[in-house]
Each structure stands twice: as structure tokens, then as C-alpha cells.
């Protein structure tokens, strides 16, 4: 006799709320003989033995409740014109019973936690009744083939919701269980799926780069945000507003909206977005320079690739700071920023920093009315020897017959660092150069006592790191003030 | 990789002066600073030059009195001390870094430190 449970040729079980007792098995080879299957009491009427005709090219039969008792074990086997066609299975039709399905209730409970959860309530099944059930769950995305099952499974004697974990925003769900009697067999048949939908998550930090709270007109400000799920694309809806007046920017992509001049404040929200949270609020307004923080500093942080930054707490305390640094030369979308309570005055930027490269820096005090920033201050992780040198100029004589000169700054990504000091050199044709330092402050010099004939200048700019290659050279024809490039 | 070594250090009669000076060698600072400790105080900012020397900076405690100055031949920065008081007493240390902003007197931001040299000034 094959042991209850275990799969083989022949599988009985009860079904539904009636009783029924289901048998069902593999397809025979001879499929016009019907067989005969045989179900005998082994508990309560040991000497009773039932006949069950099949229908031909059937193969399953169900065996009518009048024909047993409820708690009872059945032996069964089948024939096929008189010789055996399986071993004889045992059935215990206390465990043997395949339970409809669970009910799962339409209402989803979604919270964003370190991940986006959901959670989902469910009811037994009506049948078997009194009894303590196994139910195993399973979810997927809408447009999935395959399922994964949630773990663990639950009991029906205390009803624990179903919960999935670490999904994705803005994306359809299926979730489906089904049941099976405690240290019993078979499972019931899944049950028809729920389908949800997750919501669009709303930007986690929005910040704004650019100069909003310029006072030369040269306001050119970006509303930046950081995407809370990189892989997923979303667009978003953004509202502008000053006074009485809104702008709303519609199938934003992620993750900036240009900031229309005089704006006070600024809303992201997901494109469609049915929320469960506020929406995230930016005050744009401009608060006055002693509420900003004060005597920002930068220095490359030592045994680390960072910068360090501090600054003193202006003249109140803010909700929070923001420290934002961008490299030179880069468009106002590749902004960094990290927030920071009230109490810290001071971070150490998180990212690998390039030697040689410079970093704006600045750390603004945000306030429940608005913002006020501190100058922005350029720092180096490390500072390189410049790669060029300035460019050089003929400005009028001063005194008449005393030639001046003048050059520019070099950029700041050639720099590569900060201006230490100038060498200017000039050399006589066949003489030696004669160059001197100057302050990087300077940017002129006056060449008196030079004889008649004919010079060339140039001009380096020297970092901490050392001195760059010269500038382009200026010719210089005495006494007739001609002047030609090299 | 920068060292640092402090000179000058005594004592000296309320009133008096001291020179100190700080020897420089190595590359990539830009500021250098003195500091000093009083026993039983928090270390504190004095005075502050950029590498360069066009830009100076002094606690309000010694404006007036001290200044500081650089010798780029030497590679030394010099802090000259004058009329000095008995509350000027304490380890002085001279410091480096590679700081920008207006964060002159922070130590956080000067990671390179000399020994120090004692500075005493009696009544």
C-alpha cells in the first residue's frame, strides 16, 4: 500500500464544501476498457466494499459522500478487465482534503519604509471549515510569466497579512494564494489573482542649482532633483509659484525643470501621482545674507578622497543645511548636494575629487520661509601645476616711452589650482632673461629703462604645486611701438 | 610630504618681544598658520598668511600686536610678537594646509602640525 501524500498512479482526495471524494490518474494504455475502482472502510465499516464504474477514456471519477464517512480511511485501487491496474492507496480523509481557495481583499496597504511594501489582508477558505490550514502566497509584476512565492506560509489560525517586499514604484502587481490542510495533502488550486498598483514615488531631495538668489539679473537657476528609483522611468509634474501665481511644468523628465524668474516656491511631484506623502516643497525665496552661514572653509581632507567643508551658524538657526558642490565648467544639472541637521557645521563631501580639478562649493542655511547661501568658494582636492600661461598685452605708454604691459587670468581649469604668484620675463635679443614675482594680485607691469632693440615678454603663473609653462610671448620693438604676436 | 619645525620660543617681560619662526619644507599648501594652547584651554587660532603672502589674518586678541609674515626665499613664515602679556602664555604651534575660504583660523583645517615652542611672558 503506497503511504497517504506521497504522488503515484493513483491520487484521491476530497473536495469542497459537498465532500465529494476525488480520484484521479494517469492515463491508461487500453483507454476503451473502463476500469473499475474499489473504496473499502478501514475504520468504520471494515467489511464494506464499494464499486465505482468509470466512464470510458475518463481518467478521474469522483465517489459520491453517501458512499463514506467524513473522518473515515479508505483503502482504494482499480481494475482493468479483473487484474490490478495500481498498489492500493490509503486515504485519511481528515487530511486528504483539498481546500478551496483564500480570499484576498482588494484593499493594498502600501508604505514606503527602506523599500516600498505592500500588504495585503486575506480570509481562510470557506472549506474545509474548523480546520488549521497552510496557505502559501505568491506575487509577481502584472506583465510577468513567472511567480515568486512569499515566504513564510501562513497559518490560518492567526490570519498574518501577506506582505511584499522591495517593490517597484509605479508598477502593476498580481497576488495570488492558495491553501493546504496542516501536515496535510493536496494544495488547493491558486486562487484568481488581485492586481495592484504601486504609486510613483515622489523625489526624495529637491534642491536648486544655480544662482536663484542673484542680485545682478544674471538669475539662471535649474529645480534639481534626485531620482528615487534610477531604473524606472518616470516623468514628473513640477509647479512653480510666486503670490497669486502657478506655473505647472507637465511630463517633466527626471531630474530638473528650469526655475522661471521670480518663483517663491516649487513642487515635484510623479507625473500621475496618487501619493500617499506630501509632495516635496522647495521655498525658493531669498532670505537676507546674515541668515546665511559664515566663513565657509574647504580643505582637502587628509588619508581621504574627499574635501572637507566648515562654517559658522549665521545669525539663526535653520531647519537644515545644504552643501552642493559642482566641478568647474560643468552645466548646472551635475550639481551635488548633501543635507545636514542644524547642529553640523561641518561634512566631509562623500565622491572621489580630482587633483587639479576646482570644485564651487557652497553651503546654504534652508529655512521654513526660504533660503540664504553663503559665497560660493572654490577648492581644490589637490592642486597640479598649471597647464598654460596668460596671455600678454601692450597697454599705452606711461610714462611716454615707458612701455606697460598687461595679462590675463589663466581659467580656472587650466589653473588647476590657485594663482600663488606671477613670473614675468623679458629678454632682450642676445641677452640673458631677467624674470621677477609678482603678487597674484598684479596684473600689469611697467617696464621702464629699456634700451632701444627689440624684446620678447612672457608671463607664468605658479599653484602651490609649481610653476606652468609661459604664455604666449609678446614682441616688443623699442622705440617704435610696434607690436607682433609670435 | 610637508614638516614642520617651530623657533624662537622663550621668556620674556610683560611688554617684551618675541620672534617666532617656522620652517617649511615639502609642497601643495597653500596657508600657513600659528596657533597656541594655554595649559588647560582649548587650543586657539592666532594668526594666519596665504602662501604668496598678500593675504593676512589675525585673531582679535593679538591684532595690532603680532604680525605675520612669509620669507619665500627662506620658506619660513614669521610671527612677530610685540608687547606681549602674561595671557599670551602657551605652546605655540605653527600649522599647514591646503584651505581655501575664509575658514583662517579653524585648526580642522590645517592637517599638517609642528612640535610647538613655549612661550612664557611674566609680570
Known amino acids: 500500500t503506497r503511504p497517504h501524500g506521497s504522488p503515484g498512479p493513483l491520487q484521491c482526495y476530497s473536495v469542497g464544501p459537498l465532500g465529494i471524494l476525488n480520484c484521479s490518474w494517469e492515463p491508461l494504455g487500453d483507454l476503451e476498457t473502463p476500469p473499475v475502482l474499489y473504496h473499502q472502510s478501514q475504520k468504520y465499516h471494515p467489511n464494506r466494499v464499494w464499486e465505482v464504474k468509470v466512464p470510458s477514456k475518463q481518467s478521474w471519477v469522483t465517489i459520491p459522500r453517501e458512499q463514506f464517512t467524513m473522518a473515515d480511511k479508505l483503502l482504494i485501487w482499480g481494475t482493468q478487465k479483473g487484474r490490478p491496474l495500481w498498489s492500493s492507496v490509503s486515504v485519511n480523509l481528515e487530511t486528504q482534503m483539498k481546500p478551496d481557495t483564500p480570499q484576498i481583499f482588494s484593499q493594498v496597504d502600501i508604505s514606503e519604509e527602506a523599500t516600498l511594501e505592500a500588504t495585503v489582508q486575506w480570509a481562510p477558505p470557506v472549506w474545509p471549515p474548523q480546520k488549521v490550514l497552510i496557505c502559501q502566497f505568491r506575487y509577481k509584476e502584472c506583465q510577468a510569466e513567472t511567480w515568486t512565492r512569499l515566504e513564510p506560509q501562513l497559518k490560518t489560525d492567526g490570519l498574518t497579512p501577506v506582505e511584499m517586499q522591495n517593490l517597484e514604484p509605479g508598477t502593476c502587481y498580481q497576488v495570488s494564494g492558495r491553501c493546504q490542510v496542516e501536515n496535510g495533502y493536496p494544495w488547493g488550486e491558486w486562487s484568481s489573482p488581485l492586481s495592484f498598483q504601486t504609486p510613483f514615488l515622489d523625489p526624495e531631495d529637491v534642491w536648486v542649482s544655480g544662482t536663484v538668489c542673484e542680485t545682478s539679473g544674471k538669475r539662471a537657476a535649474l529645480l534639481v532633483w534626485k531620482d528615487p528609483r534610477p531604473c524606472v522611468q518616470v516623468t514628473y509634474t513640477v509647479w512653480f509659484g510666486a503670490g497669486d501665481i502657478t506655473t505647472t511644468q507637465e511630463e517633466v523628465p527626471c531630474c530638473k525643470s528650469p526655475v522661471p524668474a521670480w518663483m517663491e516656491w516649487a513642487v515635484v511631484s510623479p507625473g500621475n501621482s496618487t501619493s500617499w506623502v506630501p509632495p516635496t516643497n522647495l521655498s525658493l525665496v531669498c532670505l537676507a545674507p546674515e541668515s546665511a552661514p559664515c566663513d565657509v572653509g574647504v580643505s582637502s581632507a587628509d588619508g581621504s578622497p574627499g574635501i572637507k567643508v566648515t562654517w559658522k551658524q549665521g545669525t539663526r538657526k535653520p531647519l537644515e543645511y545644504v552643501v552642493d558642490w559642482a566641478q568647474d565648467g560643468d552645466s548646472l544639472d551635475k550639481l551635488n548636494w548633501t543635507r545636514l541637521p542644524p547642529g553640523n557645521l561641518s561634512t566631509l563631501l562623500p565622491g572621489e575629487f580630482k587633483g587639479g580639478v576646482p570644485y564651487r562649493i557652497t553651503v546654504t542655511a534652508v529655512y521654513s520661509g526660504g533660503l540664504a547661501a553663503a559665497p560660493s568658494v572654490w577648492g581644490f582636492r589637490e592642486e597640479l601645476v598649471p597647464l598654460a600661461g596668460p596671455a600678454v598685452w601692450r597697454l599705452p605708454d606711461d610714462p611716454p616711452g615707458t612701455p606697460v604691459v598687461a595679462w590675463g587670468e589663466v581659467p580656472r581649469h587650466q589653473l588647476r589650482g590657485q594663482a600663488t604668484h606671477y613670473t614675468f620675463c623679458i629678454q632682450s635679443r642676445g641677452l640673458s632673461t631677467v624674470c621677477r614675482n609678482v603678487s597674484s594680485q598684479t596684473q600689469t607691469a611697467t617696464l621702464p629703462n629699456l634700451h632701444l632693440g627689440s624684446f620678447k615678454l612672457w608671463v607664468t603663473v605658479s599653484t602651490v604645486a609649481g610653476q606652468g609653462p609661459p604664455g604666449p610671448n609678446l614682441s616688443l620693438h623699442l622705440p617704435d611701438n610696434r607690436i607682433r604676436w609670435k | 610630504q610637508v614638516q614642520l619645525q617651530e623657533s624662537g620660543g622663550g621668556s620674556v617681560q610683560t611688554g617684551g618681544s618675541l620672534r617666532l619662526s617656522c620652517a617649511a619644507s615639502?609642497?601643495?599648501?597653500?596657508?600657513m598658520a600659528w596657533f597656541r594652547q594655554a595649559p588647560g584651554k582649548e587650543r586657539e587660532g592666532v594668526a594666519a598668511?596665504?602662501?604668496?603672502?598678500?593675504?593676512?589674518y589675525y585673531a582679535d586678541s593679538v591684532k595690532g600686536r603680532f604680525t605675520i609674515s612669509q620669507d619665500n626665499a627662506k620658506h619660513t613664515v614669521d610671527l612677530q610678537m610685540n608687547s606681549l602679556k602674561p595671557e599670551d602664555t602657551a605652546m605655540y604651534y605653527c600649522?599647514?594646509?591646503?584651505?581655501?575660504?575664509?575658514?583662517?583660523?579653524?585648526?580642522?583645517?590645517?592637517?599638517?602640525w609642528g612640535q610647538g615652542t613655549q612661550v612664557t611672558v611674566s609680570s
Open positions: 615639502g609642497y601643495s599648501i597653500n596657508r
Open positions: 598668511i596665504s602662501i604668496g603672502g598678500d593675504r593676512t
Open positions: 600649522a599647514a594646509g591646503l584651505v581655501y575660504g575664509e575658514a583662517w583660523l579653524d585648526s580642522r583645517h590645517y592637517n599638517k
